[in-house]
């Protein structure tokens, strides 16, 4: 988790002065709980957008926004905590909004926005504002909290994202998976423009079981420039048993943006249909 | 123009089934998580059911949890929820709609929905 371009963060509005600041995720008014504190945020709303950075890069951003309520607490409210926790991995990282003048009732309701989370792809995170000071120990919460699930690469907004391009997400390998004779699959798949090479990576499994009966790896060389976004053809032998007969291919890429940690494409063969009425068994044998 | 469009509502008795549809045109709908949405007579909209862009994850309002299942096709941009032990208290007028950003939230919408059909009446009575 990090924050995108920190130089660049503002939280001042018309009428309100207002700084942004690191935070530890750690309240000073945990410790030092205030009698007065303010009510929760309202209307919390998240959206994925996409920023550049200096560099150029484009990377996902949380796109963080929250309205106040429309009531007296707003005279004692000193900031905003937010807080990012990305779930699998339990990392936290916040900021936090300093009120450098104290907010007033306006015309329109008070609204604020905050897009500078760098977001992973196909992950998934707790989003939560805090107003500050934080409530007394048994007093009303006064936070909202969202959990927010990034697409993956493979969404088209997604694809085109640096951290998305980098795992080769560019990469349209359109697998073929085609079932010979003699137990054998021939494989073809586009190769990408780049001399790296690639494995085969072929799992077995019986009809509507989910524990393999054969794996298979295969290596391919890395291609040379003359035959870069040709298609390549690998046949592969099968172990001849009975009813081993659902086939997952996955092409694993060695691109130098990604090593061995590149996304990779898998294509399924399924068994082939059974007849729904079993033959019938003939009640004599004939002689000849 | 952004367009969706339900269908597969009627008349039915409690502990039947009943699958809905809901058309979408206008926009990729590959990009988008999409929803289901509720309002019994007299009553206020229910978030009903909600399915991230992929179709990857699922989420239930616990009044229909075991009971709905919400699906897509991308490939035929359309979304599905399939009612099966109907109640009377599912007796609604039935919304889809889309989620104004990317992204999914579990649990509900993560922003707000920026489109919505027309609806599609369910009656559930013996």
């Known amino acids: 988790l990090r924050l995108l371009d920190h130089r660049a963060l503002v939280c001042s509005q018309p009428g309100l002065n207002c700084t942004v600041k690191n935070s530890t995720c750690l309240d000073d008014s945990w410790i030092h709980p205030r009698n007065l504190t303010p009510s929760s945020p309202k209307d919390l709303q998240i959206q994925l957008h996409f920023a550049h950075t200096q560099q150029g890069d484009l990377f996902p951003v949380a796109h963080i926004e929250w309205t106040l309520q429309t009531d007296a607490s707003i005279l004692y409210l000193e900031g905003a905590e937010l807080s990012v926790l990305q779930l699998n991995t339990n990392e936290r990282l916040c900021v936090r909004f300093e009120f450098l003048s104290k907010l007033r009732h306006h015309h329109r309701r008070w609204r604020f926005t905050f897009s500078h989370f760098v977001v992973d792809p196909d992950q998934e995170y707790e989003v939560t504002v805090h107003h500050l000071p934080k409530p007394i120990p048994d007093g009303d919460p006064n936070h909202q909290s969202k959990n927010f699930l990034v697409p993956d690469c493979e969404h088209a907004r997604m694809k085109v994202t640096t951290p998305c391009m980098s795992s080769g997400s560019l990469w349209d390998p359109n697998i073929t998976v085609e079932t010979l004779e003699a137990h054998q699959l021939r494989v073809s798949f586009t190769l990408w423009n780049e001399s790296t090479h690639y494995q085969i990576l072929l799992t077995s499994f019986p009809h509507m079981e989910n524990h393999s009966c054969f794996e298979h790896m295969h290596h391919i060389p890395a291609p040379r420039p003359e035959e870069f976004h040709q298609r390549s053809n690998v046949t592969l032998t099968l172990r001849n048993l009975k009813g081993c007969c659902r086939h997952q291919v996955q092409i694993q890429p060695f691109f130098s943006s990604c090593l061995n940690d590149c996304l990779r494409h898998s294509a399924t063969v399924s068994c082939p249909e059974m007849p729904d009425t079993p033959e019938p068994i003939p009640d004599y044998m004939p002689l000849w | 123009q952004v367009q969706l469009v339900e269908s597969g509502g009627g008349l039915v008795q409690p502990g039947r089934s009943l699958r809905l549809s809901c058309a979408a045109s206008?926009?990729?709908?590959?990009?988008?998580?999409m929803h289901w949405v509720r309002q019994a007579p007299g009553k206020g909209l229910e978030w009903v059911s909600g399915?991230?862009?992929?179709?990857?994850?699922?989420d239930y309002a616990d009044s229909v949890k075991g009971r709905f299942t919400i699906s897509r096709d991308n490939a035929k941009n359309s979304l599905y929820l399939e009612m099966k032990s109907l109640r009377d208290e599912d007796t609604a007028l039935y919304y889809c709609?889309?989620?104004?950003?990317?992204?999914?939230?579990?649990?509900?919408?993560?922003?707000?929905?920026?489109?919505w059909g027309q609806g599609t009446l369910v009656t559930v009575s013996s």
């Open positions: 206008g926009f990729s709908l590959d990009d988008y998580a």
């Open positions: 399915i991230s862009w992929n179709g990857g994850s699922l």
């Open positions: 709609a889309k989620e104004k950003g990317l992204g999914y939230c579990r649990g509900g919408s993560c922003s707000s929905f920026d489109y």
